[in-house]
């Protein structure tokens, strides 16, 4: 426990935020499921928000959702429709810095 605390303290002194991998563009078919992955790491652990065409993503029960993952965040859209087309952007912040990545879903 003591060493864990020391490691945490060291990390807190050296805050960082990194986009580990740019988001990919995704082309898929109607009715299928698309997943967009926001791969970021940081200290403190970053807060991640999702945007579609510059607006906060509207979650829909059983169809469109996002969740935290080990590597950052994943946005999943089931039963895809043409209306889902657009620019999807994840924005991550650790309270000091901001990084973002954008992908196109078509």
């Amino acid at each position: 426990p003591t060493s864990s605390w020391n490691i945490s303290s060291e990390l807190n002194k050296d805050s960082y935020l990194t986009l580990d991998e740019p988001m990919n563009n995704i082309t898929t078919s109607l009715g299928q499921t698309a997943e967009l992955h926001c791969k970021v790491s940081g200290n403190p652990p970053p807060t991640i928000r999702w945007f579609k065409n510059d607006a906060p993503v509207v979650q829909e029960p059983r169809r469109l959702s996002f969740r935290s993952t080990i590597y950052g965040s994943r946005l999943r859209i089931r039963n895809l429709d043409t209306t889902d087309t657009g620019y999807f952007q994840c924005v991550a912040t650790n309270g000091k810095e901001v990084v973002s990545s954008t992908g196109v879903l078509f």
Epitope: K52, N53, D54, V57
Partner: antibody
């Protein structure tokens, strides 16, 4: 400076065809959605079609699906709207417009080109 | 398709007046609404994007706001060059449907 310039409009008979061009400059054409929007005389704006040139992905309004084809030539930085089986109700000023990345809003528009479908 | 119901269809106002135009979306479009100004014989011009963000070069008398699925364009003090037709557009879902337009005329 960003510019979009349409051409190709004119008078055509019902059932005829026309191809509109939208020449783009001043930005990386491949990475922006390019739209066609039309406006019938004295009426409001109607979205027609969109293309994402990097891959050629396309979508159409129901009113033109199967009759109009949107395409792009990234080597010429130009988008096209091929209009077949034209009807009187297709008479309008046709604008091409660029998306304000990554918003869905259209920030740059061409000057428009008039398409008149009449016998 | 999502419907954007814009009101009023026309209004008469004087220079210096405060003008408000509203659009209601038939379902959630988050904050993805744009407003355009169009003058006769000209292409539309972007004024507001993402419901409330002022586009570059647009005078600060123009502003946008959102309350749920209701969106408002406000011109705080109408100027002579503001007499035109205004359109809203939802930009969240395809197709990016437009409102019917509001013509702002001189009283």
């Amino acid at each position: 400076e960003v510019q979009l310039v349409e051409s190709g409009g004119g008078l055509v008979q019902p059932g005829g065809s026309l191809r509109l061009s939208c020449a783009a400059s001043g930005f990386t054409f491949s990475y922006y959605f390019i739209h066609w929007v039309r406006q019938a005389p004295g009426k409001g704006l109607e979205w027609v079609a969109v293309i994402y040139p990097d891959g050629g992905y396309t979508l159409y309004a129901d009113s033109v699906k199967g009759r109009f084809t949107i395409s792009a030539d990234t080597s010429k930085n130009t988008a096209y709207l091929q209009m077949n089986s034209l009807r009187a109700e297709d008479t309008a000023v046709y604008y091409c417009a660029r998306i304000y990345y990554p918003s869905g809003a259209m920030d740059y528009w061409g000057q428009g080109t008039l398409v008149t479908v009449s016998s | 398709d999502i419907q954007m119901t814009q009101s009023p269809s026309s209004l008469s106002a004087s220079v210096g007046d405060r003008v408000t135009i509203t659009c209601r979306a038939s379902q959630s479009v988050s904050s993805a609404v744009a407003w355009y100004q169009q003058k006769p014989g000209k292409a539309p011009k972007l004024l507001i994007y993402s419901a409330s963000s002022l586009y570059s070069g647009v005078p600060s008398r123009f502003s946008g706001s959102r309350s749920g699925t209701d969106f408002t364009l406000t011109i705080s003090s109408l100027q002579p060059e503001d007499f035109a037709t205004y359109y809203c557009q939802q930009t969240y879902w395809y197709p990016g449907t437009f409102g019917q337009g509001t013509k702002v005329e001189i009283k």
